[in-house]
């Protein structure tokens, strides 16, 4: 006979898992807000800044009531993967102007990566269907100028802030349904 079975694995409380995800998301939200403020101080720029390659905002605040957990986590993970790719691109191709935002951009990238791993873990703990592997994304073209890099950075941080704000609200609402 084989070795005696070990003690049964205690499945972590999904609400506690969701709590730690909310904390990570909120921390990243504050980081993003502060970094965007720093960037605007260093490079004042009027108006809204857009980047076509960024994901569209997942959900309006008014539509939060209709959320379902699998859909939220899958969409959030996809959007955050896109933002991670954009932050990596920014650090690589953003130009010398954005070097003044190191190490903050590096910290942001590391925390974004940590949040993505946390979401992946949460999805497996909740036995949600795992999303298919991400198709290779087309490479992002380098900014046309230093000013283009700054505008791209403002767009990325602005979009990430909105996405994370939506995520915190959504995750807290979903927690009440678990």
């Amino acid at each position: 006979p084989g070795p005696p079975p070990g003690p049964p694995r205690v499945s972590p409380d999904p609400r506690a898992e969701l709590d730690s995800t909310v904390l990570l998301t909120r921390s990243l939200l504050a980081d993003t807000r502060q970094l965007a403020a720093q960037l605007r101080d260093k490079f004042p720029a009027d108006g809204d800044h857009n980047l076509d390659s960024l994901p569209t905002l997942a959900m309006s605040a008014g539509a939060l009531g209709a959320l379902q957990l699998p859909g939220v986590l899958t969409r959030l993970r996809a959007d955050l993967l896109s933002y991670l790719r954009h932050v990596q691109w920014l650090r690589r191709a953003g130009g010398s102007s954005l070097k003044t935002l190191e190490p903050e951009l590096g910290t942001l990238q590391a925390r974004l990566d940590r949040l993505l791993r946390r979401l992946q873990l949460l999805m497996s703990r909740l036995a949600l269907p795992q999303p298919p592997p991400d198709p290779p994304a087309p490479p992002l073209a380098p900014p046309s100028s230093a000013w283009g890099g700054i505008r791209a950075a403002l767009a990325i941080l602005g979009g990430l802030h909105l996405t994370l704000d939506w995520a915190v609200r959504g995750l807290l609402l979903l927690k009440t349904r678990l």
Partner: antibody, heavy 120, light 108 residues
Framework: EVQLVESGGGLVQPGGSLRLSCAAS????????MHWVRQAPGKGLEWVAY????????YYADTVKGRFTISRDNAKNSLYLQMNSLRAEDTAVYYC?????????????WGQGTLVTVSS | EIVLTQSPATLSLSPGERATLSCSVS???????LHWYQQKPGQAPRLLIY???NLASGIPARFSGSGSGTDFTLTISSLEPEDFAVYYC?????????FGQGTKLEIK
């Protein structure tokens, strides 16, 4: 030594205006975000407004939005709060405060406060 | 808006005793954004603890902070006469930045 000194408080009628100033010394003023926090007589603390070092990001409490304007002059090491359309409930001691660091919103240093009284 | 609720509203203790003040937060917040202040009558507040558990410069070691998520605590291990004051917790993770309503620590 970090010093923050507020001035400009006083008695004003409802609907009136007042401009508070905060003179900063002992640190590189242009490197830190600054806040205004107020305290009504016998009450708790209420955050009012925040401005980043370069003035390009500003936040206000909902209670003062559209009536108060925070600004700064880094060349003069000064922070300002322009208060318009004043109401009785704006009566308070107003403190200027410096953030702890650029990545933490704790209020590390405070002025002694200036009293604003809104009354007819 | 994130709401901070402090308890008790008033705490009556004697010098030498241990004081435990609580701050309950309406939403989960990362601990690095929870701060504690002390205010004495007629004076400006002063930062005691930042990031839930870090002692601010010049603050005696009898003060300590702990907690995470929604529940945070300020502890004064052995009360000195000068510790009797009002204590506020504050969050800086979300705008508007908000304070608790305060706990008054008074001499018994």
């Amino acid at each position: 030594e970090v010093q923050l000194v507020e001035s400009g408080g006083g008695l004003v009628q409802p609907g009136g205006s007042l401009r508070l100033s905060c003179a900063a010394s002992g640190f590189t003023f242009s490197s830190f975000g600054m806040h205004w926090v107020r305290q009504a007589p016998g009450k708790g603390l209420e955050w009012v407004a925040y401005i980043t070092p370069g003035s390009n990001t500003i936040y206000y409490a909902d209670t003062v939005k559209g009536r108060f304007t925070i600004s700064r002059d880094n060349a003069k090491n000064s922070l300002y709060l322009q208060m318009n359309s004043l109401r009785a409930e704006d009566t308070a001691v107003y403190y200027c405060a410096r953030e702890y660091s650029s990545y933490d919103e704790g209020f590390a240093y405070w002025g002694q406060g200036t009293l604003v009284t809104v009354s007819s | 808006e994130i709401v901070l609720t402090q308890s008790p509203a008033t705490l009556s203790l004697s010098p030498g005793e241990r004081a435990t003040l609580s701050c309950s937060v309406s939403d989960l917040i990362p601990s690095q954004y929870l701060h504690w202040y002390q205010q004495k009558p007629g004076q400006a507040p002063r930062l005691l603890i930042y990031g839930a558990s870090n002692l601010a410069s010049g603050i005696p070691a009898r003060f300590s902070g702990s907690g995470s998520g929604t529940d945070f605590t300020l502890t004064i291990s052995s009360l000195e006469p000068e510790d009797f004051a009002v204590y506020y917790c504050q969050q800086g993770v979300d705008v508007p930045f908000t304070f608790g309503q305060g706990t008054k620590l008074e001499i018994k």
